[in-house]
Amino acid sequence: MAVTACQGLGFVVSLIGIAGIIAATCMDQWSTQDLYNNPVTAVFNYQGLWRSCVRESSGFTECRGYFTLLGLPAMLQAVRALMIVGIVLGAIGLLVSIFALKCIRIGSMEDSAKANMTLTSGIMFIVSGLCAIAGVSVFANMLVTNFWMSTANMYTGMGGMVQTVQTRYTFGAALFVGWVAGGLTLIGGVMMCIACRGLAPEETNYKAVSYHASGHSVAYKPGGFKASTGFGSNTKNKKIYDGGARTEDEVQSYPSKHDYV
């Protein structure tokens, strides 16, 4: 029962994590303009992995996609790759783990097969979570580096007369979503791996031993139960869960009341 719960919980946690990784990857707010002493700004810039946006105090938001591959920084490409790999591995992991779930019966699938699938999905979730955390962390590091570089030369100009204020960027909401989602996927993967240990049948069978009860000539043969798991391959003694399978670019937007500047 504990194994089923651990496996089920691992699946749910990973599912939430992967949904979060997808959300973070699609979000536009990976980096947002640093407002430092100025909470109200006439022009607010924010950037994602796929496009950059500008929200004006008038309420208009304009987003422009990065319509180039070669012109983009290598770090951004690396972050994109990590996030996509994380999503793909997570999606495959979810698919595998659905079939591995103890509560879902598919034909006459052996527990050993389910254990292997659970382990596989667990490893996939762990790698997926690590990819997301790595991607977000690389982007965050890039932001920190750029932040201090732009702070060092905050004002540049000719003879101090004409000033150009450099836009500094800080952590956007997507980074926090990505970190949390990556962590959840990682935890879910670990839970799946733990559940796999409980599912996996141990190889050593106890030999049939005769026990003679005094005054009786009855021999008890345990019948080759697998040790310590409670889920041996002896179908005569094993409870079968047969409740049936249970399926558990330029874009411009007009201001809306939810666009706050």
Partner: antibody
Framework: EVQLVESGGGLVQPGGSLRLSCAVS?????MNWVRQAPGKGLEWVAW????????TYADDFKGRFTISRDDSKNTLYLQMNSLRAEDTAVYYC???????????WGQGTLVTVSS | DIQMTQSPSSLSASVGDRVTITCKSS????????????LTWYQQKPGKAPKLLIY???TLESGVPSRFSGSGSGTDYTLTISSLQPEDFATYYC?????????FGQGTKVEIK
């Protein structure tokens, strides 16, 4: 079609107060108050987000002027306190548009500060 | 605060003339996020409210005649009227729309020669 109609202007004594209103019809996300002293240029006074009520002011008006809005009446206000002779001007409300320009303006209301 | 300086303060021209008004800002109005300059131009006639002509330094507001055009980037901007019409005699203002507080130039009065 957006329409802006100001009211509330008039003669007031130095140190006195006055509240200007701007009736807004049509969609507006954010609004501005701009003033123009007789024979002088345009001077931006304040801005407000019509949904959150978040304001911002030009330095000269912080503490003396308060921009606000009434959602139910779809009205913009400018509360002016501690008025001085140099506050004598025509006050306009204007809707913020793309590029942070101001595309619709009211007809203006004259405020005269004199003893 | 960003200071806006317009020149000339007034000019005399005839109908059909090409008129150029310049506006200089103390700070760049170019936004790195969308590579647009947040400078706006207005026209005001005596006793009337200002009228929006150009935003983003060069984008014509709908309904504004094509003889009006805007150009410039960074700190230097220009409003050009290719062929002055009788209804164009008015005062023109540039405005910083990039950062609060919004600031206007002192105005350029276009008069009949």
């Amino acid at each position: 079609e957006v329409q802006l109609v100001e009211s509330g202007g008039g003669l007031v004594q130095p140190g006195g107060s006055l509240r200007l209103s701007c009736a807004v019809s049509g969609y507006t996300f954010s609004m501005n108050w701009v003033r123009q002293a007789p024979g002088k240029g345009l001077e931006w006074v304040a801005w407000i987000n019509m949904y959150t009520g978040e304001p911002t002011y030009a330095d000269d008006f912080k503490g003396r002027f308060t921009i606000s809005r009434d959602d139910s009446k779809n009205t913009l206000y400018l509360q002016m306190n501690s008025l001085r002779a140099e506050d004598t001007a025509v006050y306009y409300c204007a809707r913020a548009s793309r590029g942070n320009g101001m595309d619709y303006w009211g007809q203006g209301t004259l405020v005269t500060v004199s003893s | 605060d960003i200071q806006m300086t317009q020149s000339p303060s007034s000019l005399s021209a005839s109908v059909g003339d090409r008129v150029t008004i310049t506006c200089k800002s103390s700070q760049s109005l170019l936004n790195s996020g969308n590579q647009k300059s947040y400078l706006t131009w207005y026209q005001q006639k005596p006793g009337k409210a200002p009228k929006l002509l150009i935003y983003w330094a060069s984008t014509l507001e709908s309904g504004v005649p094509s003889r009006f055009s805007g150009s410039g980037s960074g700190t230097d901007y220009t409003l050009t009227i290719s062929s002055l019409q009788p209804e164009d005699f008015a005062t023109y203002y540039c405005q910083n729309a990039y950062s609060f507080p919004f600031t206007f130039g002192q105005g350029t009065k276009v008069e009949i020669k």
